[in-house]
Amino acid sequence: PLATIPVSTTSLTSSEGSTISTPSVDISTPVTTSIVGDQCSRCKNGGFWDGLKCQCLTPYYGESCEEVVNSIDIAPPETVSAQMELTVTVTSVKFTDELKNHSSQEFREFNKTFTEQMNIVYSGIPEYVGVNITNLRLGSVVVEHDVLLRTKYTPEYKTALDNATEVVKQKITKVTTEQIMTNDNCSALMCFNTTGTQVQNITVTQYDPVEECRQKAEEYEDYFLVEYRDQKPYCISPCESGFNASKNCNHGKCQMSQNGARCLCVTTETHWYSGEDCNQGTQKSHHHHHH
């Protein structure tokens, strides 16, 4: 048999004006009951009984997972990155089959010199992390490689990485135009064929706090939103205080339902409170309105 759970009641008035005696369980949310062995608990909304208490799924909390949290943890990555797939042609080195073998002395030496050269080229770009050769092929040496960029996550990270990729393009174009062979020899660390420089692809980290917030809010996705504090995104409902979108319930309690945030107005010994924001007080003794 199902165990009966005592439910405390509070005298609250809905913003529509009628007095209701509400259990601490939100009656507007669907109820699913989780039973483990002889233990039974009214763990709602997908929550489960762990033998001691209900383990609730986001965005629910409470003794029976009946309440909706006011804020949901979203965790943007500390850093975001971009990967540029580039091809350049090095003319100051003659291709040999050994260069195909990444464990050969030839490859290691080429990799060291090429990396050193690219570190010089991109030295002024704060987002620059390094280069990674993916393939070497004949012609003299066609170098397929990735340029790796990284920056701290901010709401404007895409702009920062987009700008960095543009600077990479400018710098590699400049060096492969200037460092060319003269009299069949190279006086630079490496020389290039100007026409062999190509940007094949650019991949940027995709992180959208709004999307993560909506996904975690599940059926409440339309009522949770993202606000920023100190460049950090917060996934909040209007019931979370201290944000621009916070709902002021004055003489009442903000509660989430599947229809959004609503104010449950309190009744005190001296006043009834009503209105959408529980800001209309009626004195019990004189029935006098205060605004």
Epitope: V93, K94, Q105, S187, M190
Partner: nanobody, 124 residues
Framework: EVQLVESGGGVVQPGGSLRLSCAAS????????MAWFRQAPGKEREVVAF????????YYADSVKGRFTISRDNSKNTLYLQMNSLRAEDTAVYYC?????????????????WGQGTMVTVSS
């Protein structure tokens, strides 16, 4: 680890000859470029000549063309520089350099392995 040891330097009169040698050891590859660079007092290091492993390419600086000859004996892992008609301006420390790559560069920074150098003084 690759090691390069030069020998054959010394004092010679203008118009005289010298033969420098460079013994290479520690190479795992049988294909590599070798070069001679030199550095005169107060000047930057400059290329004298280089040669590819198979002798398929040689390069000479304009200042030594027709007077110096670079060669190598792969069986002995040794590089040579035959210097004829020496001039006072050839006075410098001569360095042997190597790379496992077939380098076509005269920039010393592109060459990863270096010997300690041997002094050549041309003076009357």
């Amino acid at each position: 680890e690759v090691q390069l040891v030069e020998s054959g330097g010394g004092v010679v009169q203008p118009g005289g000859s010298l033969r420098l040698s460079c013994a290479a050891s520690g190479y795992t590859s049988n294909r590599y470029s070798m070069a001679w660079f030199r550095q005169a007092p107060g000047k930057e290091r400059e290329v004298v000549a280089f040669i590819w492993t198979d002798g398929g390419r040689t390069y000479y600086a304009d200042s030594v063309k027709g007077r110096f000859t670079i060669s190598r004996d792969n069986s002995k892992n040794t590089l040579y520089l035959q210097m004829n008609s020496l001039r006072a301006e050839d006075t410098a420390v001569y360095y042997c350099a190597a790379s496992s790559l077939l380098l076509q560069t005269i920039n010393p920074r592109a060459w990863p392995y270096w010997g300690q150098g041997t002094m050549v003084t041309v003076s009357s």
